[in-house]
């Protein structure tokens, strides 16, 4: 299911990098979140629960990430103009069932003031 544009601030700039915020409902217990740049998978994070409610976090395509009870943040560093693109949060929900996939995204504009190592 494609939901289109994120209805929240998806990109947070700091120190020449960007935090890309991928939100999900807090009822969701087990999921995979992928960060897509265009159609390419940049990062992913999978959260599963084992016996005794032990939480497992795995990444096949590792990026610096941060998990909360309703969001995954992916961090991109050393921004340059090539980072400008459409970015999508691709959420696959495993629990609660049934399996659902939802895609939200937005365009990352890169301005001079946000670049990492701008010449003075």
């Amino acid at each position: 299911e494609i939901n289109g544009s994120a209805n929240y601030e998806m990109f947070i700039f700091h120190n020449g990098g960007v935090q890309i915020l991928c939100k999900y409902p807090d009822i969701v217990q087990q999921f995979k979140m992928q960060l897509l740049k265009g159609g390419q998978i940049l990062c992913d994070l999978t959260k599963t629960k084992g016996s005794g409610n032990t939480v497992s976090i795995k990444s096949l395509k590792f990026c610096h990430s941060q998990l909360s009870n309703n969001s995954v943040s992916f961090f991109l560093y050393n921004l340059d103009h090539s980072h400008a693109n459409y970015y999508f949060c691709n959420l696959s929900i495993f629990d609660p069932p049934p399996f659902k996939v939802t895609l939200t995204g937005g365009y990352l504009h890169i301005y001079e003031s946000q670049l990492c190592c701008q010449l003075k």
């Epitope: 299911e1 939901n3 994120a6 209805n7 929240y8 939100k23 999900y24 409902p25 807090d26 009822i27 969701v28 309703n70 959420l91 929900i93 609660p96 069932p97 049934p98 399996f99 659902k100 996939v101 939802t102 939200t104």
Partner: antibody, heavy 125, light 108 residues
Framework: EVRLVESGGGLVQPGGSLRLSCATS????????MHWVRQVTGKGLEWVSA???????YYSDSVKGRFTISREDARNSLYLQMNSLRAGDTAVYYC???????????????????WGQGTTVTVAS | EVVLTQFPATLSLSPGERATLSCRAS??????LAWFQQKPGQAPRLLIY???NRATGIPARFSGSGSGTDFTLTISSLEPEDFAVYYC??????????FGPGTRLEIK
């Protein structure tokens, strides 16, 4: 009012098989998660099985390994293959559909808002 | 498995009276609860979803409330066609999806 139409019920001996079907032409079938729910005469409702829009399947413990749910979206149809039937499977079987929509931090569940009229399965020798 | 308990098992009231039906869940199901009405020989009909949202075509005299583990279905003024069996159902912690045992609403 949207209608689902079940068929395939009947009398079968213990250990036998039946295939139930459920069809509609009146709503966007492929956007619904579909379920089978059964009811013994004079008793309550018991969930049997479900299939999600992505084809993911779920079963109650009482039918796991004996029943198989499937769907054919191009035909707006739902099926339940019932094998190794037991007397305890005797019931009216309803097909029903519900929807879950995820948008950002919102998880909407709209309930089982479409139902068929039911088809009777009797397992007896 | 989430167990749903409904009470009372039978409720005897007269047309025009207010009916209050209760459903209790064995664990927190937030607001992911639905209510169904079933008449003899008919399929169940969805009345309320998300604990408090009326389904399409359901009269305003039906209302739902509650969250977590305790839920209520209220019929503000009973009509003759409201006498039936009412079931609550959860579909957030599953499989299995579970239904309550039902409350029979009968004419006094």
């Amino acid at each position: 009012e949207v209608r689902l139409v079940e068929s395939g019920g009947g009398l079968v001996q213990p250990g036998g098989s039946l295939r139930l079907s459920c069809a509609t032409s009146e709503f966007i079938f492929n956007s619904y998660d579909m379920h089978w729910v059964r009811q013994v005469t004079g008793k309550g409702l018991e969930w049997v099985s479900a299939i999600g829009t992505a084809g993911d399947t779920y079963y109650s413990d009482s039918v796991k390994g004996r029943f198989t749910i499937s769907r054919e979206d191009a035909r707006n149809s739902l099926y339940l293959q019932m094998n190794s039937l037991r007397a305890g499977d005797t019931a009216v079987y309803y097909c029903t559909g519900d929807r879950t929509v995820v948008r950002g931090v919102n998880y909407y569940y709209y309930g089982m808002d479409v139902w068929g009229q039911g088809t009777t399965v009797t397992v007896a020798s | 498995e989430v167990v749903l308990t409904q009470f009372p098992a039978t409720l005897s009231l007269s047309p025009g009276e207010r009916a209050t039906l209760s459903c209790r869940a064995s664990q927190n199901i937030r607001s992911y609860l639905a209510w169904f009405q079933q008449k003899p020989g008919q399929a169940p009909r969805l009345l309320i979803y998300g604990a408090s949202n009326r389904a399409t075509g359901i009269p305003a005299r039906f209302s739902g409330s509650g969250s977590g583990t305790d839920f209520t279905l209220t019929i503000s003024s009973l009509e003759p066609e409201d006498f039936a069996v009412y079931y609550c159902q959860q579909r957030i912690s599953w499989p299995p999806i579970t239904f309550g045992p039902g409350t029979r609403l009968e004419i006094k």
